[in-house]
Structures are given as structure tokens and as C-alpha cells.
């Protein structure tokens, strides 16, 4: 059912570097999982190239990826999630390069959302909360989160805090007074599943209060 490349095309193809990377997202759309692959070399001519996954699937032997500009994508319920699948780059019926991958080891969680920071005057601290869609999932439920914050003027001076819950307390005395801060959070699988950091959540910006001279405490905004 597939077309065949002409010999010249294949000879050219064999000279190229077809190394690729993939990540999976489980229960990303209801009960559907997704798998996204892309070539590591952005200059690869992808015109006749297709991706295919075979093995460790439910009721099918293989699945074809859809091409979305530079990325290749599958959304399906048919990942078995036990054992390794073989992912191949193909020209027609010929495989150019393949990788055996367990989809549970290349999981990229969805980005956290609803990040917010509330100042507690009496406690002299900031309560950071955020949400994650993974609390409702059957598979990738347990995540490690990386909260990163910086003073807005310090371009690359991020402070990172790792936590497993979705709530963090920042002590006021650890922050500069009367300063604008940027904070963001990302997640990575932390139990059974392995993989990659999610995208960062949208940043949240908050200002620390001024120091109240009489008590040495910061003023709330």
C-alpha cells in the first residue's frame, strides 16, 4: 500500500543522519495517549520520510504517525504500555533507522497550570500553589515538581525547589524586600514511569512588601 522510493532517493537517504527523539504523553486526551517524534537534525529533508511504531500495541501490529510540519505524531488508545516498541524512520517499505523504546520511559508530563502566590501577613511567608492534570490520571500520577523563582532583575539567577506536593511555602526573610519576582513550575515522572521534564507553566509575577522600619518587617502590598 505504500509507495517505493526510487533508488537514487534511497542512496541519498542513506547518507543522512536520521537520529530522532520521541516523548510519550499518557492519557493526554481522555483515555488517549500520544507519542511525538522529531529528527534531531532540523535540516533533514523530511519530504518522503515516515515514522512507524510496531510492537507492544493493542489489537494492531503497527501504527503510522501523522506528520505535522517538522514533528511526527500519534494519538491513540492502542499503546500496551508493557514492553518495548520498535520505532522506525521509513522511506516507502525500507527502514532507515529504528529504536527500541519502552514508552513508559519517555514520558513527558503535561505542564502544571494555575500557578499562584499568596502573601500571608501574619505568617510572613508566601504560599505557592499550582495545579496539575496528573492528579486525575490513572497512570502517571506521581510527579516531582521543580519550582523556579528569581528576582526579575536577575536574568539567569534562578532558585530551584523540588517538591512532590503542589504547595510550597517561601519564607519572606529569604526574599528581597520591595522586589518583583517571577516564579514558574514544571514536572517530571517520579514513580515507575520515567522520562523528561514537562514544559514550564506560564510564569506568575509577585511583589514582596517593603520593610516596615519600626518592626523590621515587610509591609504587605
Amino acid at each position: 500500500e505504500s509507495g517505493y522510493a526510487q533508488n537514487g532517493d534511497l542512496e541519498d537517504a542513506e547518507l543522512d543522519d536520521y537520529s530522532f527523539s520521541c516523548y510519550s504523553q499518557l492519557e493526554v486526551n481522555g483515555s488517549q495517549h500520544s507519542l511525538t517524534c522529531a529528527f534531531e537534525d532540523p535540516d533533514v529533508n523530511i519530504t518522503n520520510l515516515e515514522f512507524e511504531i510496531c510492537g507492544a500495541l493493542v489489537e494492531v501490529k503497527c501504527l503510522n504517525f501523522r506528520k505535522l510540519q517538522e514533528i511526527y505524531f500519534i494519538e491513540t488508545k492502542k499503546f500496551l504500555l508493557i514492553g518495548k516498541s520498535n520505532i522506525c524512520v521509513k522511506v516507502g517499505e525500507k527502514s532507515l533507522t529504528c529504536k527500541k523504546i519502552d514508552l513508559t520511559t519517555i514520558v513527558k508530563p503535561e505542564a502544571p497550570f494555575d500557578l499562584s502566590v499568596v502573601y500571608r501577613e501574619g505568617a510572613n511567608d508566601f504560599v505557592v500553589t499550582f495545579n496539575t492534570s496528573h492528579l486525575q490520571k490513572k497512570y502517571v500520577k506521581v510527579l516531582m515538581h521543580d519550582v523556579a523563582y528569581r528576582q526579575e532583575k536577575d536574568e539567569n539567577k534562578w532558585t530551584h525547589v523540588n517538591l512532590s506536593s503542589t504547595k510550597l511555602t517561601l519564607l519572606q526573610r529569604k526574599l528581597q524586600p520591595a522586589a518583583m519576582y517571577e516564579i514558574k513550575v514544571r514536572s517530571i515522572p517520579d514513580h515507575y514511569f520515567k522520562g523528561f521534564w514537562s514544559e514550564w507553566s506560564p510564569s506568575y509575577y509577585f511583589r514582596t512588601p517593603e520593610i516596615n522600619n519600626s518592626s523590621g518587617e515587610m509591609d504587605p502590598i
Epitope: G30, E59, V60, K61, L63, N64, R66, T76, K78
Partner: antibody
Framework: EVQLQQSGAELVKPGASVKLSCTVS????????IHWVKQRPEQGLEWIGR????????KYDPKFQGKATLTADTSSNTAYLQLSSLTSEDTAVYYC??????????WGQGTTLTVSS | ETTVTQSPASLSMAMGEKVTIRCMTS??????MNWYQQKPGEPPKLLIS???TLRPGVPSRFSSSGYSTDFFFTIEYMLSEDVADYFC?????????FGAGTKLELR
């Protein structure tokens, strides 16, 4: 070239059994699922079941459980459908079909089974 | 089990007319709907596979659309060679289930 070659027409008596064959070429039967579909004259298509020849794992539509038995012989690249306790309701064309991807792509030419005394 | 309801049962169309067939499913099957053409004495032929993907060699006048539970198959303009039975098949879950078919005739 992918082909599924089915055995010839059968005329059998009620109560008897019959075994239909489907020999594939152009691919390894272990790399596919083989599905079986029933089509009665002027009626729709009915899914009977499927076999994974690599593992002999089978699944049946509950309607055909006990009526149909699916087997495969990987050495001859052949799948079989056995139908038992035949009645006139089993008179139909039976197709074997390949499923590699998320669709049934190549179909055999069909075997006509007539159950009559 | 996912029930597939296909309509209409028959259609009589003039040459060049647009043909539309609908299949509805009793459960959400995402985009796992396939469309087949069958001519007398022949096995079914796959025209469009899941994800509304036109199979190689199938004329571009054939197309499909739909997602979840509601699916449409279209022949943009009817030709005499399109006289046949058409049916849909869901491959989302077992047992696989077919639509009852649409007999397309030339008026």
C-alpha cells in the same frame, strides 16, 4: 504482492462441521492479525473474530463463541476458520482479512459456504 | 459493544451529483472509522482508513470527515463506476462492528 488466497466453495449438510483456509503471501502471517468476516446474501457484514498467529491468541464476537474456532499454522502462512453444528443460518460468504495497522486492508476473495440437506 | 448506525440504506444519484453517507456510533471511537466499497462478487475495498486518510490509489473525489460518534463519507461527484455498496467499520474496539451498508445506484 500481498495476497490472501481462500479455499474453494463448500456444500455441507446441516449438523456437520467445515474448516475453511486462508493462505497468505507477500508478508509473514506472524506480522499481522487475521480477522474473519461473515457476509450473508443481502445482509450486512459481521465480524466473527481474529487470531494473532504469532501467539495463537484469539478473540471472538460473543455471537460466534462456540460456533467458530480460529487457528493458524505459521509454517505454511495459513489461517483457518472452523465452523461447527452447521445450520442454514451459516450459509454465507466468509472472508479472511489482514490487519497490520488500524484498519482491515487486504481481504481474501471469500469462500462461499452453503449448508443444505 | 459499539453499535454503528449507517444511513441511508439506499441512494439513487445522477451522474455528477454529490453523495453523502453517514455513520453514527453508540460510543466515542475517536477517529477509528473506516470506509469500504464493495461491488457484486468482489471483496470489500478499503477507500478511507482511520483518521480520514484516503488510501493510496483511491480517487480524490472520495473523502470522509467526523470524529467521536458522528462520521460522514462523501463522493464529490458521482461516476458510473461508483455504483456499489458502501459501508463503514469501526476499529476502535472489539468486537469490530460494521454499518449495515448503503446501496448506491445510478438514477
Amino acid at each position: 504482492e500481498v495476497q490472501l488466497q481462500q479455499s474453494g466453495a463448500e456444500l455441507v449438510k446441516p449438523g456437520a462441521s467445515v474448516k475453511l483456509s486462508c493462505t497468505v503471501s507477500g508478508f509473514n502471517i506472524k506480522d499481522t492479525y487475521i480477522h474473519w468476516v461473515k457476509q450473508r446474501p443481502e445482509q450486512g457484514l459481521e465480524w466473527i473474530g481474529r487470531i494473532d498467529p504469532a501467539s495463537d491468541d484469539t478473540k471472538y464476537d460473543p455471537k460466534f463463541q462456540g460456533k467458530a474456532t480460529l487457528t493458524a499454522d505459521t509454517s505454511s502462512n495459513t489461517a483457518y476458520l472452523q465452523l461447527s453444528s452447521l445450520t442454514s443460518e451459516d450459509t454465507a460468504v466468509y472472508y479472511c482479512v489482514r490487519r497490520v495497522y488500524d484498519y482491515l486492508d487486504y481481504w481474501g476473495q471469500g469462500t462461499t459456504l452453503t449448508v443444505s440437506s | 459493544e459499539t453499535t454503528v448506525t449507517q444511513s441511508p440504506a439506499s441512494l439513487s444519484m445522477a451522474m455528477g451529483e454529490k453523495v453523502t453517507i453517514r455513520c453514527m456510533t453508540s460510543t466515542d471511537i475517536n477517529d477509528d472509522m473506516n470506509w469500504y466499497q464493495q461491488k457484486p462478487g468482489e471483496p470489500p475495498k478499503l477507500l478511507i482508513s482511520e483518521g480520514n486518510t484516503l488510501r493510496p490509489g483511491v480517487p480524490s473525489r472520495f473523502s470522509s470527515s467526523g470524529y467521536s460518534t458522528d462520521f460522514f463519507f462523501t463522493i464529490e461527484y458521482m461516476l458510473s463506476e461508483d455504483v456499489a455498496d458502501y459501508f463503514c467499520l469501526q476499529t476502535d474496539n472489539l468486537p469490530l462492528t460494521f454499518g449495515a451498508g448503503t446501496k448506491l445506484e445510478l438514477r
